[in-house]
Interface confidence: low
């Protein structure tokens, strides 16, 4: 057969769907690889062909669109399962072609089982809510296109196993779940089950997401440098190891890049010749405020090193701060026989 532009297996789009639920999967060609949409391709006389490779097999097979109750069907650029079965797991390929043009891409589809409390191997999206910030909502995700607007589905929300009803600060409102005032105790997995009728059958869509309550922008402050500070002096003798921690607290800020760095005599450590190492550790509070510690280490400090300026810098979306460490050379204790004797005028 003639050459086909093969985009390979698009593992970036690992699609997971629940067993025994409807699934609609768009051909990724039009979403991510081609510069035109399905309508344009169809108008130009191109045909979209689907086939698949079962899990643990190499053989490409056509998809059977003649199953009872049209369990698998194609509509425009969408492959429909009504519903999925566990053995639908495999690599699916959509190919767009006519006599002169061909382009195809494969993608993995995994049909996963869920247990009675909606636990499963499904990778869950995370939705962040600001702590004590007023009313915030999450929306039941990825249910568009499953039923027409004329159909009114029933939506049930769960927190873990619990149906959400008579919760103090969480109120189901159809496709939305409202948090009147989000608290740490609201952290957890939330599931919406959307039930809708179609051609005399009832289908369920299960969507689970993780809610993480994070620090509120109302409480956000510029970075705070806890160390170095004015109370600690790093007093060393030449030849000793110099260790200076730079410990910085960052308020949680959505999409903020938190940075900590050292300068020595105004230069980055990489740009100077002394043998310095920097080790970083990061910890987070329950509301995802962040504490970063960068320890500057010079194994065998020289008297020259002890005269340098060591400054810790920190930056977030809220601002930039800097603090110099107090470093000095330890004055050696006097040796009595020589120094004190000289002081008394001994010869």
């Amino acid at each position: 057969s003639e050459r086909c532009d093969d985009w390979g297996l698009d593992t970036m789009r690992q699609i997971q769907v629940f067993e025994d639920e409807p699934a609609r999967i768009k051909c990724p060609l039009f979403e991510h690889f081609l510069k035109f949409n399905y309508s344009t391709a169809h108008s130009a006389g191109l045909t979209l062909i689907w086939y698949w490779t079962r899990q643990d097999r190499d053989l490409e097979e056509p998809i059977n669109f003649r199953l009872p109750e049209n369990r698998i069907s194609k509509e425009k650029d969408v492959l429909w399962f009504r519903p999925t079965l566990l053995n639908d797991t495999g690599n699916y390929t959509c190919m767009l072609r006519n006599t002169t043009y061909c382009s195809k891409v494969a993608f993995p589809l995994e049909v996963v089982q869920k247990d009675s409390c909606f636990n499963s191997p499904m990778k869950l999206p995370v939705h962040k809510l600001y702590i004590e910030y007023g009313i915030q909502r999450i929306t039941c995700p990825n249910v568009d296109g499953y039923f027409p607007s004329s159909v009114k589905p029933t939506i049930t929300w769960y927190m873990g196993c619990y149906k959400i009803q008579n919760f103090n600060n969480v109120i189901p409102e159809g496709m939305n779940l409202s948090f009147l005032i989000a608290l740490i105790s609201n952290n957890g997995n939330y599931t919406c089950v959307v039930t809708y009728p179609e051609n005399g059958r009832t289908f369920h869509l299960t969507r689970t997401l993780t809610v993480k309550v994070v620090g509120s922008p109302k409480n956000a402050v510029p970075p705070v440098i806890h160390s170095p500070n004015d109370h600690v002096v790093y007093e060393k003798e030449p030849g000793e190891e110099l260790l200076i921690p730079c410990t910085v607290y960052f308020s949680f800020l959505m999409d903020s890049r938190n940075e900590v760095w050292w300068t020595i005599d105004g230069k980055k450590p990489d740009d100077i010749t002394i043998d310095v190492t920097i080790n970083e550790s990061i910890s987070h509070s329950r509301t995802e405020d962040e504490t970063r510690t960068q320890i500057l280490s010079i194994k065998k400090v020289t008297s020259e090193d002890l005269k340098r300026s060591y400054v810790c810098h920190a930056r977030s979306a809220k601002g930039e701060v800097a603090k110099a460490a107090k470093v000095k050379q330890k004055v050696p204790a006097p040796r009595y026989t020589v120094e004190l004797a000289c002081g008394f005028g001994a010869t």
Partner: antibody, heavy 111, light 110 residues
């Protein structure tokens, strides 16, 4: 409230259906579990039906027990019982913390 | 999968004393743990759910704590009416598990 019924003396190998009758709340809003307790023993989970009608079972109960429901009842069908199935059978509301239990119904399996 | 080990099997306590009952899951159950009290001839009574939330009408002498795989029920200021068998139950998964309940702890009040 919850009330179990259907418990009786049966012979090994037959079948029996226990019924849990619900009042005061809707089964479309709650999960329901079945639990049993052999004389002088601890609580043993059998299985559970969620608010949407999906049923789930303990590994040992699969194939021998079936949970189903109507709008006001939850049934537990026991097939091919043995003397080890002699117990008081309870139904309870919810799964991750059952706040409402029936008084239980006694099933005795003896030849 | 999600097997529950409850200790001790039995404990004696004087009136006014404190009892600690432990429940360990074979893997993390993410706070989905309930505690029940059962007296002879009665169904279980829910004390605590979601690991630490007190059920309606239950005395604050009962306290639940823990996370991950390890959970604890503490009864302080024990009264003679607390003599009963106590069970933990994981509510994380009800599918294909051996038993969601722990083996039980008999509390004897002297």
């Amino acid at each position: 409230s919850l009330e179990e019924s259907g418990g009786r003396l049966i012979t090994p190998g037959g079948s029996l259906t226990l019924t849990c009758t619900v009042s005061g709340f809707s089964l479309s809003s709650y999960h329901m579990q079945w639990v049993r307790q052999a004389p002088g023993k601890g609580l043993e989970y059998i299985g559970y039906i969620n608010s949407l009608g999906g049923s789930y079972y303990a590994s040992w109960a699969k194939g021998r027990f079936t949970i189903s429901k109507t709008s006001t009842t939850v049934d537990l069908k026991i097939t091919s019982p043995t003397t080890a199935d002699t117990a008081t059978y309870f139904c309870a509301r919810d799964f991750a913390g059952s706040d409402l239990w029936g008084q239980g119904t006694l099933v005795t399996v003896a030849s | 999968a999600y097997d529950m080990t409850q200790t001790p099997a039995s404990v004696e306590v004087a009136v006014g004393g404190t009892v600690t009952i432990k429940c360990q899951a074979s893997q993390s159950i993410d706070y989905y743990l309930a505690w029940y009290q059962q007296k002879p001839g009665q169904p279980p009574k829910l004390l605590i759910y979601r690991a630490s939330t007190l059920a309606s009408g239950v005395s604050s002498r009962f306290k639940g704590s823990g996370s991950g795989t390890d959970y604890t029920l503490t009864i302080s200021g024990v009264e003679s009416a607390d003599a009963a068998t106590y069970y933990c139950q994981q509510g994380y998964s009800g599918n294909n598990v051996d038993n969601t309940f722990g083996g039980g702890t008999e509390v004897v009040v002297k």
